[in-house]
């Protein structure tokens, strides 16, 4: 049974040419996080895998940076970056949890960069920002 919930930074805005951090946090479940996908509409931006660490899609390598934590940093923003972003948590045994963030990239300097919450850095093991492996092998 899926008991977890995903908190996200919600609706956010940023200035053209600037950068923004997209963050999600999965709570209320003991499920093992095996992978987190970041997607923009149906385009894959990045993956953070428990075994492999981060993989950034080649077409976004210049403008996407992993972290902090399981979050994603978008750089050199353009107006075309406006839209929906999804964090997709693959977990065992619960299954897939999805969080939604809407980003608006503004021409002017009235963008607010504040996020609703800070992800606690202690939530994730390992220095290389891999998802928590939980108890390891499951059988």
């Amino acid at each position: 049974m899926m008991t977890g919930t995903i908190e996200t930074t919600g609706n956010i805005s940023a200035e053209k040419g600037g950068s923004i951090i997209l963050q999600c946090h999965l709570s209320s479940t003991t499920a093992q996080v095996t992978q987190v996908n970041w997607e923009q509409q149906d385009q894959l931006l990045a993956i953070c895998n428990a075994d492999l660490g981060w993989h950034i899609s080649p077409s976004f390598k210049d403008r996407v940076a992993p972290g902090p934590g399981l979050g994603l940093t978008l750089q050199s923003l353009t107006v075309n970056d406006t839209g929906e972003y999804f964090c997709i948590y693959h977990t065992y045994p619960d299954g897939t949890y999805t969080g939604r963030i809407f980003l608006e990239v503004l021409e002017s300097s009235v963008a607010e960069h504040g996020a609703r919450f800070q992800i606690p850095t202690g939530d994730y093991k390992d220095d290389d920002d891999k998802p928590n492996k939980g108890s390891g092998t499951t059988s």
């Epitope: 149906d42 895998n49 075994d51 299954g95 897939t96 999805t98 492996k133 059988s139």
Partner: antibody
């Protein structure tokens, strides 16, 4: 070109054991999770087991849990399925399949190896 | 476990026909459904994943739609090489489960 080649199938008596192998080539094996899926004669597909790229996550179908063991050797680009306490209902073609990088869908499959459990 | 129910179990169609196969999950699987094609004596081939994303190299006459519990595979204009058995698979949660298959035969 991605290639997956299974071997090790054959005829075995009930209660016996077999070890299946899957040799991978044409891609960076150590980056991908791998599945075993089986298909009984004239029947549909049944997922059997999964192992993540670095072996930290291993899952089994309830029908094989405690009897089958999935493992991999990334240095040898090989996937294995150790099958013990075999039953007649384990008779099937066994396929190894690669998991997509992003989802648990299976994007490349081997040609399969037949396992027959009969006395 | 999530049960996947495909319909119909078989159908007869002609080259050029529009063919629709449905798959229903026993509970919501969001968009996480894959479709496979299997020909006799051959391994399955991935056509579509995440409900509607076409696997690289798959002809555009194949399309997928749906979310939640109800999904559809459509072949817009059936070709001779499309006569095969089609399976759906949920990749939302463990254990990953398949539908029973739909055999597409020549009318």
């Amino acid at each position: 070109e991605v290639q997956l080649v299974e071997s090790g199938g054959g005829l075995v008596q009930p209660g016996g054991s077999l070890r299946l192998s899957c040799a991978a080539s044409g891609f960076t094996f150590s980056n991908f999770g791998m599945h075993w899926v089986r298909q009984a004669p004239g029947k549909g597909l049944e997922w059997v087991a999964f192992i993540s790229s670095g072996s930290s996550s291993i899952y089994y179908a309830d029908t094989v849990k405690g009897r089958f063991t999935i493992s991999r050797d990334n240095a040898k680009n090989s996937l294995y399925l150790q099958m013990n306490s075999l039953r007649a209902e384990d008779t099937a073609v066994y396929y190894c399949a690669r998991m997509r990088l992003d989802y648990y869908a299976m994007d490349y499959w081997g040609q399969g190896t037949m396992v027959t459990v009969s006395s | 476990d999530i049960q996947m129910t495909q319909s119909p179990s078989s159908l007869s169609a002609s080259v050029g026909d529009r063919v629709t196969i449905t798959c229903r999950a026993s509970k919501s699987i969001s968009k996480y459904l894959a479709w496979y094609q299997q020909k006799p004596g051959k391994a399955p081939k991935l056509l579509i994943y995440s409900g509607s994303t076409l696997q690289s190299g798959v002809p555009s006459r194949f399309s997928g739609s749906g979310s939640g519990t109800d999904f559809t595979l459509t072949i817009s204009s059936l070709q001779p090489e499309d006569f095969a058995t089609y399976y759906c698979q949920q990749h939302n949660e463990y254990p990953w489960t398949f539908g029973g298959g739909t055999k597409v035969e020549i009318k």
